[in-house]
Interface confidence: low
């Protein structure tokens, strides 16, 4: 196995929920074999870890939800990479394996006595973020009847219940955003378009749907390319040169891409001096993420992106922005993140990182340049879904009993899945959370536009919406120049 | 987990090699959730199990190969299905998981003493046959540094060592047969072709290569469709109707398909009365398999297929054809197979199957209608590769020592992989077995043609070869009619 010792965030409880978040970026190509992950991530990583920990605290202090039952968690890092996520998922299922080892008489004590385990099994898993990774994790979890609720894995393939029975999500399938992207292309009469997608399930299936729908609408996808998110500069440059060769005819580039693929494209545009040459139409892997455009805003200007509608969660910020490294010890990645975020050394701390020369000032605060993860509402809704599913299961299996009755020891994954599929409740933003027969949720998208708002000031603005097949666009806003 | 209790074939030894063979057909769509497999298979299943058992006997009695070391095996059924194969692979790695559980103090005996395991870990895995399934298995095995040697998983994707480091194969990548198929299309000036592929890695990546190469050669792939091997009749009929709608222009149908997909197409042709309407060009998933055409020969006539060159292995037949259910007790599937093969009941036997009315006659023999698995040579070469890799590793780690020295206890998968990659030896058919930097083997294909040889007598005949980019075809043979 990898020599990397995997860090885990634990919270005790009567029932343990697993979670996979991309606490670190994916391994670079040369580090894939060691499964050595990249730098720590704030929005997709640390914020989601904290969302899990704090949401469980809120659930545990809610007397109407799972009374007399404490929810705990085991949070692991997926590094946005299949091999790492699979390795971590094996840790989730280890307990199931060992209990069946014992049944089969493969674990024996030297004196013939029985063994016991000191770790509670995982009843369900939240995440991971990436569709490709979620598929691999689901392939494993479903063998053990462990339900999985995703908060941002939107690939259409995951709707197939014959293949992914124990998979559910609080987000819609990408079939809908592919339709939205085609509707935007139609609206502006772009008949000749280049296409790029991220290698992997999210990009491939999304782009396939986009192409199929485009063909039906008479839109010519002139050239189509794919690239890995973690591809090297050379690969991105090569791709950009190909796209350049189709200018000016194919100025519009539809990108069904993960955020880091878009960032790779923007960086290549800078290297090749191609800012302003293309109009990018991006899927929700880009959405309104600043970590995609940071430092490459000029190249991104004009980009039109799809974003799942998810307002900021105020109570999360109230909690998160008070966190400090000397007190937040339950998050094992927090000190590493703090040093990375402020590029300083936590001198004298357990995880002091000597690569930073400057010592961290005690007046530092997360309020500085804070941006809440755009999928925060979905992460929280996924956790609440698991809680409501368990609550309904408890009500049905333990009528008139507060707490875990014998019928719920151990928790049967098949029954939990049934209960989860029937769950409906009011989500964190006031929207109804429910699941269709494929475990998918209904969805509504916002259409964003990345603009230069003033001299050297860039931002995403909302220029429209797509709701259940209906596209609304503020055309004047899309085509107006702000920086005058 | 599945309620199905999985059967395993064991052979004891100092070193245990795992193997995944499709002893049964894949689950039908309605049985996928239970992972309840289909009927027992002879060529792809039982013959491979017996090849493994007998090849290990030959290796163990060879004084020059691994002297003083006995190779044993643990053979599991993949059912040509990812979920089943993954479930079985988890059994292979169980031991690694448990040993690390103990290291981490997660397994304790009630009196505090230590526990011990009664099962040797698997050092490597042979198989499985399908590329899609092999990918899933590799994703898991590589986390535990367990080398995997495939005998028929030919997908191009598997050449990517950043993704599949512990994967090797004694067959070439499909990039080569895609090229061969394009060369055939070119040779006969078929400029307008329909395309079908099996959903899953083998079909998808193969068809992608076929399309890319076709485009470069100015061949128009008019329409392209995909279908699951285990899709229902309705799905196959729907696909055939689409193909029919492009007749007569797109008469040629290039099928980068697993054998059972081709069989599904032939069955749909029968239902829709489309025999003789298409000319099928099939990849090596079809090759010269009788289980593909059986009962649907008239629909398959004219089909041109690609087959990996692999002569029959005489010594295997000498062993296999003598097997009998009363004596062959080490193969736990043999009685089930015998009853299925001869459609009779082994009365009074442990695995007597009451669904058959007729009692098996003691004069039955496997010689009747015997066909050796077309991939037999590859299966055996894969097993020998593992043995030679271990032999070279032992020579290097235990110089001057016969048997397993301390440096090989336990066996380090990384070192074994290195040793395997450097392995070269004379294969079972006299060919050189070696691996390039991607773990791939060189390959040569035969071009087969399915013909009516006489009244109601059909067979595959060799009509050409493709060797390292050079296509040779006996055009007269391809277009001649035999049944006159």
């Amino acid at each position: 196995q990898s020599s990397e010792r995997r860090v885990v965030a634990h919270m005790p409880g009567d029932i343990i929920i697993g979670a996979l978040f991309s606490v670190h970026h994916q391994p670079t190509v040369d580090k894939v074999h060691e499964r050595k992950c990249g730098a720590v991530r704030e929005q997709y990583g640390i914020q989601r870890v904290e969302a899990m920990l704090h949401t469980l605290e809120r659930i545990n202090s809610d007397p109407t939800l799972l009374p007399n039952i404490t929810l705990g968690c085991e949070i692991r890092d997926s590094c946005w990479h299949s091999a790492v996520a699979l390795e971590q998922s094996i840790e989730f299922i280890r307990d199931s394996l060992i209990s069946s080892e014992e049944e089969e008489g493969l674990v024996r004590c030297v004196d013939g006595s029985s063994s016991f385990r000191s770790k509670k099994p995982i009843v369900g898993v939240i995440g991971p973020g990436s569709s490709s990774v979620a598929i691999q994790v689901q392939n494993l979890l479903q063998l053990f009847n462990i339900p999985q609720i995703a908060y941002s894995a939107t690939s259409m393939d995951l709707s197939d219940k014959t293949l992914f029975k124990y998979f559910m999500r609080v987000v819609p399938s990408d079939a809908q955003q592919a339709r939205a992207m085609v509707d935007i292309v139609k609206r502006y009469n772009w008949t000749y378009v280049s296409a790029v997608h991220t290698e992997g399930n999210y990009g491939e299936s999304g782009m396939e749907a986009f192409k199929d729908m485009s063909a039906k609408e008479g839109i010519c996808i002139a050239h189509s390319y794919k690239i890995y998110s973690n591809a090297g500069e050379q690969s991105f440059d090569k791709l950009l040169k190909k796209l350049r060769s189709h200018l000016p005819k194919a100025r519009v580039v539809a990108c069904f891409c993960e955020g880091m693929t878009v960032r790779g494209l923007l960086m290549a545009m800078r290297r090749l001096g191609l800012a302003g040459e293309f109009l990018l139409l991006g899927s929700d892997g880009w959405a309104d993420r600043y970590d995609v455009t940071d430092g490459y805003q000029r190249e991104a200007v004009g980009g039109i992106t799809i974003k799942l509608q998810s307002p900021d969660v105020k109570w999360f910020d109230d909690y998160y922005l008070k966190l400090r490294p000397e007190t937040n010890l339950r998050n094992p990645w927090f000190q590493e993140f703090w040093q990375h975020r402020f590029q300083c050394r936590l001198e004298g701390f357990a995880q002091e990182n000597s690569k930073y020369n400057k010592t961290c000032n005690s007046s530092l605060t997360l309020r500085t340049h804070h941006v809440q993860d755009s999928k925060m509402g979905f992460v929280i809704n996924a956790i609440y879904s698991m809680a409501y599913g368990l609550h309904n299961m408890q009500m049905s299996l333990c009528p008139g009993y507060a707490g875990l009755c014998d019928a719920m020891k151990p928790i049967d994954g098949r029954k939990l899945l049934d209960s989860l599929m029937k769950t409906n409740f009011t989500g964190v933003s006031g929207d109804m959370i429910l699941f269709d027969e494929n475990g998918d949720s209904p969805g509504r998208y916002e259409i964003m536009n990345f603009k230069e708002m003033g001299k050297d000031y860039f931002d995403y603005i909302n220029v429209g919406s797509w709701d259940n097949g209906e596209l609304k666009m503020d055309d004047d806003e899309v085509w107006s120049k702000k920086n005058n | 987990q599945s309620s199905e209790r999985r059967v395993v074939a064991h052979m004891p030894g100092d070193i245990i090699i795992g193997a995944l063979f499709s002893v049964h057909h894949q689950p039908t769509v309605d049985k996928v959730h239970e992972r309840k497999c289909g009927a027992v298979r002879e060529q792809y299943g039982i013959q491979r199990v017996e090849a493994m058992l007998h090849t290990l006997e030959r290796i163990n009695s060879d004084p020059t190969l691994l002297p003083n070391i006995t190779l044993g095996c643990e053979i599991r059924d993949s059912c040509w299905h990812s979920a089943v194969a993954l479930e079985q692979s988890i059994e292979f790695i169980r031991d690694s998981l448990i040993s690390s559980e103990e290291e981490e103090g997660l397994v304790r005996c009630v009196d505090g003493s230590s526990s011990f395991r009664s099962k040797k870990p698997i050092v490597g895995v042979i198989g499985p046959g399908s590329s899609s399934v092999a990918i899933q298995v590799q994703n898991l095995l590589q986390l535990f540094n367990i080398p995997q040697i495939a005998y028929s998983a030919t997908s191009m994707d598997l050449s990517d060592k950043t993704l599949f480091k512990y994967f090797m194969r004694v067959v070439p990548s499909d990039a080569q047969q895609a090229r061969a198929m394009v060369d055939i299309v070119k040779r006969y000036n078929w400029t307008y072709v329909s395309a079908v592929h099996t959903e899953g890695n083998y079909g998808e990546s193969g068809m992608e290569a076929f399309k890319d190469m076709s485009a470069k050669e100015g061949i128009c792939i008019a329409h392209s469709y995909k279908i699951y091997s285990n899709a229902g009749e309705q799905s196959f009929d729907k696909l055939l109707k689409k193909l029919r709608s492009h007749l007569p222009k797109a008469r040629v149908v290039a099928c980068f398909c697993e054998g059972m997909t081709v069989r599904g197409l032939l069955m749909a042709m029968r239902r829709l009365g489309l025999a003789g309407e298409f000319l099928l060009l099939g990849s090596d998933g079809w090759a010269d398999r009788y289980d593909v055409t059986d009962g649907y020969q008239r629909e398959a006539v004219g089909g041109i297929t690609i087959k990996l060159q692999s002569p029959d292995v005489k010594w295997f037949d000498d062993y296999y054809l003598k097997l009998r259910p009363e004596t062959n007790l080490r193969n736990p599937w043999f009685q089930e197979f015998w009853q299925h093969r001869f459609q009779c009941r082994l009365e009074g036997f442990a695995q007597e199957n009451s669904k058959y009315n007729k009692t098996c006659n003691s004069s039955l023999t496997l010689r009747t209608h015997h066909v050796q698995d077309s991939k037999m040579g590859f299966v055996i070469n894969a097993i020998y590769s593992m043995a030679y890799g271990l032999h070279n590793m032992q020579m290097s780690l235990c110089p001057g020592y016969a048997g397993l020295c301390d440096a090989m206890k336990p066996i380090d998968g990384r070192k074994l992989l290195d040793s395997l990659m450097k392995t070269n030896f004379t294969g079972v058919s006299g060919d050189m077995i070696l691996f390039d930097e991607n773990g791939d083997s060189p390959g040569r294909y035969e071009i087969m043609n399915f013909k009516e040889m006489g009244k109601d007598y059909f067979d595959y005949i060799n009509v050409g070869s493709w060797d390292n980019g050079e296509l040779k075809m006996d055009d007269d043979e391809v277009w001649s009619k035999k049944n006159n």
Epitope: - | M395, S396, P399, G400, Y401, D406, A407
Partner: antibody
Framework: QQQLEESGGGLVKPGGTLTLTCKAS?????????MCWVRQAPGKGLEWIAC???????TYYASWAKGRFTISKTSSTTVTLQMTSLTAADTATYFC?????????????WGQGTLVTVSS | DIVMTQTPASVEAAVGGTVTIKCQAS??????LAWYQQKPGQPPKLLIY???NLESGVPSRFKGSGSGTEFTLTISDLECADAATYYC???????????FGGGTEVVVK
């Protein structure tokens, strides 16, 4: 009985080249061993230089020895150590030793050593 | 490269007594450590390999222990013939290199 004998030592000028030979008797290298060179400056400790695997002639060097020293298996019973650009610091008794590995099993058979003196 | 630090440089003990020599590796070398005895004008003689395994023909009075970075050679029931210089040799598997300690001179009174 099994023994190793070093030869080729002597006086050499700074900047010079010298080749030492280790001859094994009672040992057939086809048994696959690691033949190594270790040196010891007068009154000082031992210093590992290099090993060669008699199976395939694979070599293993101390980082300081790479480039200037070359170990080779020259026949089924001899191993050589070629030394170039010699300086006074290379003055030492050079021992030939045999092990079952590059180092993890130690060296269980040693020659008596040959003295190399680098001096003008 | 790996560095082996041996202590003490010299030790004196009476016949029948016990001597302990320590060897520290700059990196973890697991159990890849050997101990040698060298007498003037002679080549070294292997005593212990793999940290604690006694070479055949070596008296059981010689005992090796330790793993990782800290190792010990203990000689009990000292005899006059044990007067010699003792060296540890560490093997660093990752770089396939060896290093010897500086040696410990044992004087037997």
């Amino acid at each position: 009985q099994q023994q190793l004998e070093e030869s080729g030592g002597g006086l050499v000028k700074p900047g010079g080249t010298l080749t030492l030979t280790c001859k094994a008797s009672g040992i057939d290298f086809s048994g696959y061993y690691y033949m190594c060179w270790v040196r010891q400056a007068p009154g000082k400790g031992l210093e590992w230089i290099a090993c060669v695997y008699t199976g395939d002639g694979g070599t293993y060097y101390a980082s300081w020895a790479k480039g200037r020293f070359t170990i080779s298996k020259t026949s089924s019973t001899t191993v050589t150590l070629q030394m170039t650009s010699l300086t006074a610091a290379d003055t030492a008794t050079y021992f030939c030793a045999r092990g079952s590995g590059v180092g993890s099993y130690g060296y269980n058979l040693w020659g008596q050593g040959t003295l190399v003196t680098v001096s003008s | 490269d790996i560095v082996m630090t041996q202590t003490p440089a010299s030790v004196e003990a009476a016949v029948g007594g016990t001597v302990t020599i320590k060897c520290q590796a700059s990196e973890s070398i697991y159990s890849n450590l050997a101990w040698y005895q060298q007498k003037p004008g002679q080549p070294p003689k292997l005593l212990i390999y793999r940290a604690s395994n006694l070479e055949s023909g070596v008296p059981s009075r010689f005992k090796g222990s330790g793993s990782g970075t800290e190792f010990t050679l203990t000689i009990s029931d000292l005899e006059c013939a044990d007067a010699a210089t003792y060296y540890c040799q560490g093997y660093y598997a990752i770089t396939t290199t060896n290093a010897f300690g500086g040696g410990t001179e044992v004087v037997v009174k």
